[in-house]
Interface confidence: medium
């Protein structure tokens, strides 16, 4: 079955720049299928823009200005790229790639969509680092004692743009756990969001990960925030500044017993 | 030009109570097109639900039913037993793929219908209230309450900032909520909740334990992609309640 991944959840540009949005096709050879691009402007219907067929034929929707959009595909990386030239305010939208996928039963095709990339246009000069800054909250003693469950909370602050995806996994599992989240909130020129995960008592001794996808993550990779097991033996050490350094550096945690 | 028009912009549904979405076609006979339904959830994910010819997306066949009312020129999608997972925006779309002649393989979409899911009407349930802290940050966790109306107060004399609470449906079909704030005196912050004309305090749920019973991080930025800034504890930390732990991440 065909699967579409749009690695950029957002793409932030200043006016008149060029945006390149990527769509990675798996499960089907890209040179043996047609890839379609759709746009959803705020408050408008989702609209077909352009497609590139397996033989390289490009078809644009009538009424789309010529030279605005360019579509191509790179078989080596199984990627289709939508290029938007000379971006302007009216290009603010979420852009989806899509393809028709055959089902086992003959006559059945469905159009599957990628997760979308939101094009954001800004005139602001932002701080150098507008990636999400994480703070973790571990379960309160009261909750674990009284309810035989514990809630982890992952707070992300000072990020821009507002497009962010958060999910949770146990350390050695790829299964996405059922979590809950608040709305993304504006704080001055940046945004904050939090997500929480409640796990049964038997899972409290496992390490959990809050995984964050954001356009401005360092090196463009998902940020993994580690929640240590809470039933753990603790080694006494000299206090140090509570900073995290490089990804493979030792991280010092200051621990306290809270009674609430 | 052809247009697909949803019957409603917003449809509130109750968990377990069947709901019907309708989408009418203007300017053409619906029988000349194939109708598709999609759901867009938080984070913009567009998931295929149904296409004419009895095609359902993975996991949708048991709980959804697509239909066409030729006489009324409209498409119908029934959600047989809604759950909180069914919240999102629902889109009808059409194509003429395989209707003879040249294919129109593009989809023409209608505007979305926002489906909001509410718990079933049920006996009132008092919340449990817990406080979680990290440095100046305090979170008040309010669990398993019904009905939805609630006021959450983080009690402090030294507030830096507070955020609107997030109220969501819990997996058991009640409500959960979290309110976050930043306080200079986070150690002394408690949470009180007004619900159903009663007040519930986080202190009602405190467990009397000795200080070694349950150790947990005070404040950390524990991440595989560390940020450039450092959070230093602003609160006064009593050393008899502190351990230091070294973790390699």
């Amino acid at each position: 079955a065909g699967h579409l991944e749009q690695p950029q959840i957002s793409s932030t540009k200043t006016l008149s720049k060029t945006a390149r949005l990527e769509c990675v096709v798996s499960g089907i050879t890209i040179s043996a299928t047609s890839v379609y691009w759709y746009r959803e402007r705020p408050g408008e219907v989702i609209q077909f823009l352009v497609s590139i067929s397996y033989d390289g034929t490009v078809r644009k929707e009538s009424g789309i200005p010529s030279g605005k959009f360019e579509v191509d595909r790179i078989p080596e990386t199984s990627t289709s790229t939508l290029t938007i030239h000379n971006v302007e305010k009216q290009d603010i939208a979420t852009y989806y790639c899509a393809l028709w996928e055959a089902q086992q039963e003959l006559g059945k095709k469905i159009k599957v969509f990628g997760p979308g990339t939101k094009l954001i246009i800004t005139d602001k000069q932002l701080d150098a680092d507008v990636s999400p800054k994480p703070t973790i909250f571990l379960p309160s003693i009261a909750e674990t004692k009284l309810q035989k469950a514990g809630t982890y909370l992952c707070l992300l602050e000072k990020f821009f743009p507002d497009v962010i995806k958060i999910h949770w996994q146990e350390k050695k599992s790829n299964t996405i756990l059922g979590s809950q989240e608040g709305n993304t909130m504006k704080t001055n020129d940046t945004y904050m969001k939090f997500s929480w995960l409640t796990v049964p008592e038997k899972s409290l001794d496992k390490e959990h990960r809050c995984i964050v996808r954001h356009e401005n993550n360092k090196n463009g990779v998902d940020q993994e925030i580690i929640f240590p097991p809470i039933k753990t033996d603790v080694i006494t050490m000299d206090p140090k500044d509570n900073c995290s350094k490089d990804a493979n550096d030792t991280l010092l945690l200051q621990l306290t017993n809270t009674s609430a | 030009a052809i247009e697909l028009v949803p019957e409603h912009q917003t449809v509130p549904v109750s968990i377990g109570v069947p709901a019907t979405l309708r989408c009418s076609m203007k300017g053409e006979a619906i029988g000349n097109y194939y109708i598709n339904w999609y759901r867009k959830t938080q984070g913009n994910t567009m998931t295929f639900i149904y296409r004419e010819k009895d095609i359902y997306g993975p996991g949708f066949k048991d709980n959804f039913q697509g239909d066409i009312d030729i006489a009324k020129n409209l498409a119908v999608l029934k959600i047989l037993a809604p759950s909180e997972r069914d919240e999102g925006s629902y889109y009808c779309a059409c194509d003429t793929l395989g209707m003879g002649g040249e294919y129109t393989d593009k989809l023409i979409f209608g505007k979305g219908t926002r489906v909001t899911v509410e718990p079933r009407s049920q006996p009132h349930t008092k919340p449990s209230v817990f406080v979680m802290k990290n440095g100046t940050n305090v979170a008040c966790l309010v669990k398993e309450f019904y009905p939805k109306d609630i006021r959450i107060n983080l009690v402090s004399s030294k507030k830096i900032t507070e955020f609107d609470p997030a109220i969501v449906i819990s997996p058991s079909g009640k409500y959960n909520a979290v309110k976050l704030g930043k306080y200079e005196d986070s150690n002394s912050v408690t949470c009180s909740v007004q619900h159903d004309n009663k007040t519930v305090h986080s202190t009602d749920f405190e467990v009397k334990t000795d200080s070694t019973d349950h150790v947990k991080p005070k404040e950390t930025e524990n991440t595989k992609q560390p940020s450039k800034s450092c959070h230093k504890p602003k609160a006064i930390v009593h050393t008899e309640k502190v351990n230091m732990m070294s973790l390699t991440v």
Epitope: L106, G107 | Y103
Partner: antibody
Amino acid sequence: QVQLVQSGAEVKKPGSSVKVSCKASGGSFSNYAISWMRQAPGQGLEWMGGIIPFFGTPDYAQKFQGRVTITADKSTSTAYMELSSLRSEDTAVYYCSTGGGYGDYDYYYGINVWGQGTMVTVSS
Amino acid sequence: DIVMTQSPLSSPVDLGQPASISCRSSQSLVHSDGNTYLSWLQQRPGQPPRLLIYKISNRFSGVPDRFSGSGAGTDFTLKISRVEAEDVGVYYCMQAKEFPLTLGGGTKVDIK
């Protein structure tokens, strides 16, 4: 009415590949599925796979997966079937066929128009 | 894969007499769209096959009305009401409900 004309007979060595073409005329090549079948001497018909040129995504029978490649060139209204790693048991007449027009888009499937067949002999 | 089983393997018939060929599928050929995608093909000696019947009982254009198809679900029959000399050949049933398309092993019809 669509007509299908296939390329001529081929003699191939074991381990090599063969590419058979099938040119359509007189109809809408893009919209109909092209199937490839084969028939070994004195044996029955076997479906190898097919393609709807409009989409270009081929469907293969599991037995041939990895050895067969079916493609289509809309500009010349020609479909191709390439079979690699040939062995003597691949000696057969290879047919292209199309399900033009009685039913729905994906039904290969009221296969009603056939090429004349291409004899492929695999021999050392 | 859906397995198609035909019987008999061979059917010698007198000219002008009826002939009947049976085809059984290993699972129902009823598609979720309500149609049953069972076809019958005829292959005369030295020629490519040709379509006779589609969707159980629909004769393809130009096919004489002495050919008829019937059946449902998993059991299907092709009948020739009066066999003529030009009907000599091998007859195949084929399912087009699911990938991969599969065919029966063939039934040879010849004149006694």
